[in-house]
Interface confidence: medium
């Protein structure tokens, strides 16, 4: 890659308001590779970090005997991120295809940035109560990996057929969905 | 059902080079899927190696590059493990897992004289 | 190479005790951890992957977690069965390194 279409980070974040907030909806939108992209009339030549997002994931944890008291509220990081002129064709033209040819050296990822470590009430069959300490994520961002980061986690995790397809928006959409599936 | 079953000679001399199968049933390693090879040393200390991917490209631990090959016989729906120049430290249990989590049974190779 | 410190090293357990272990990376690892179970025949199972999606078919009593860089796998209750090895995996970045493993026995 040519250092002008890869190297230069700037740290716009997508950040829709999920219609549905519950915990299913949002992870399962995040999984499966919904998309969300800002073309707000930003000038042609702008470089912004498209499709990373911030979902809200409403969940009860549980530790197999007990189950939170009240909700849990973090945010789920979803979506790609892709620093490339935003043009309102930008989905298919030669440009894109070429960016996330498999054999891309440099690939960015939306990834945790923030996260803080709070106290969680658990309440138990017996009526007793547990406290957990956890982490939860606060902030996303768009970080740059090699293409040995993104094709070691494949790797281990996928599920799908990991063939490469023609149409790199179908591509991305078939990583996504497998992401967090089993082998 | 997808298994896998490596075998191999079981004992190699040293300096000598080592050559292990893994075959695949119930899935074609064409198909999708990274196919990797992991060995367990005496003591319980695991080691991945490297893998080949459904495409025929390879990942190789550096610390075993200049030594290691993964090819595959996609007609017999197998895939090998080659360590030249091999040393007794290269004795262990040999495992071939596709991704993560559907592991062989285990093979095991000693180097001796 | 990404180094795991994998504690303890071994473990004497009851039947129906809640234990943990856990697994420290040296570099940022994102959550791409994995814990397998290797029973005394040889036989490697993955039971957990993202640091804390429990694969199919392994029992709820299992559970990992993270905060920062360790890694936590923790046993609610101990069965016979879960009386094994255990070890994490990071799968961040190639080479995949694994912990230096924790034999879990009866007390």
């Known amino acids: 890659f040519k250092n002008d279409a890869t190297e230069i980070l700037y740290s716009h974040v997508v950040k829709p308001v999920p219609a549905h907030p519950s915990s299913n909806s949002t992870l399962n939108q995040a999984r499966n590779g919904g998309r969300h992209f800002s073309n707000t009339g930003l000038d042609r030549n702008t470089r912004v970090q498209v499709g990373c997002r911030e979902l809200r994931s409403t969940k009860y944890i549980s530790d197999g005997q007990c189950t939170s008291i009240s909700p849990l509220k973090e945010l789920v990081c979803a979506g790609e991120c892709l620093p490339l002129p935003v043009l309102p064709n930008w989905i298919g033209g030669g440009y894109g295809t070429k960016y996330w040819s498999r054999r891309s050296s440099q690939e960015w990822r939306c990834v945790n940035d923030k996260t803080r470590t709070q106290r969680i009430q658990l309440q138990c069959q017996d009526g007793s109560t547990r406290t957990y300490k956890i982490t939860v994520v606060t902030a996303c961002k768009c970080k740059r990996y090699t293409r040995q980061h993104n094709e070691s986690s494949h790797n281990f995790e996928s599920m799908s057929p990991a063939k490469p397809v023609q149409h790199h928006r179908e591509r991305k959409r078939a990583s996504k969905s497998s992401k967090h599936s089993m082998s | 059902d997808v298994q896998l079953q490596e075998s191999g000679p079981g004992l190699v001399k040293p300096s000598q080079s080592l050559s292990l199968t893994c075959s695949v049933t119930?899935?074609?390693?064409?198909?999708?899927?990274?196919w990797n090879w992991i060995r367990q040393f005496p003591g319980n200390k695991l080691e991945w190696m490297g893998c080949?991917?459904?495409?025929?490209?390879?990942n190789y631990n550096p610390s075993l590059k200049n030594r290691i090959s993964i090819t595959r016989d996609t007609s017999k729906n197998q895939f090998f493990l080659k360590l030249n120049s091999v040393t007794t430290e290269d004795t262990a249990t040999y495992y071939c897992?596709?991704?993560?989590?559907?592991w062989g049974q285990g093979t095991t190779l000693t180097v001796s004289s | 190479d990404i180094q795991m410190t994998q504690s303890p090293s071994s473990l004497s357990a009851s039947l129906g005790e809640r234990v943990s272990l856990t697994c420290r990376a040296s570099?940022?690892?994102?959550?791409?951890l994995s814990w397998l179970q290797q029973k005394p025949d040889g036989n490697i199972k993955r039971l957990i992957y993202?640091?804390?999606t429990l694969d199919s078919g392994v029992p709820k009593r299992f559970s990992g977690s993270r905060s920062g860089s360790d890694y936590s796998l923790t046993i609610s209750r101990l069965e016979s069965e879960d009386f094994a090895d255990y070890y994490c995996?990071?799968?961040?970045?190639?080479?995949?390194?694994f912990g230096g493993g924790t034999k879990l026995e009866i007390k």
């Open positions: 080949i991917s459904y495409d025929g490209s390879n």
């Open positions: 995996l990071q799968y961040a970045s190639y080479p995949w390194t």
């Open positions: 993202a640091a804390s």
């Open positions: 119930g899935y074609s390693i064409t198909s999708g899927y990274y």
């Open positions: 570099q940022e690892i994102s959550g791409y």
């Open positions: 897992a596709r991704g993560g989590l559907l």
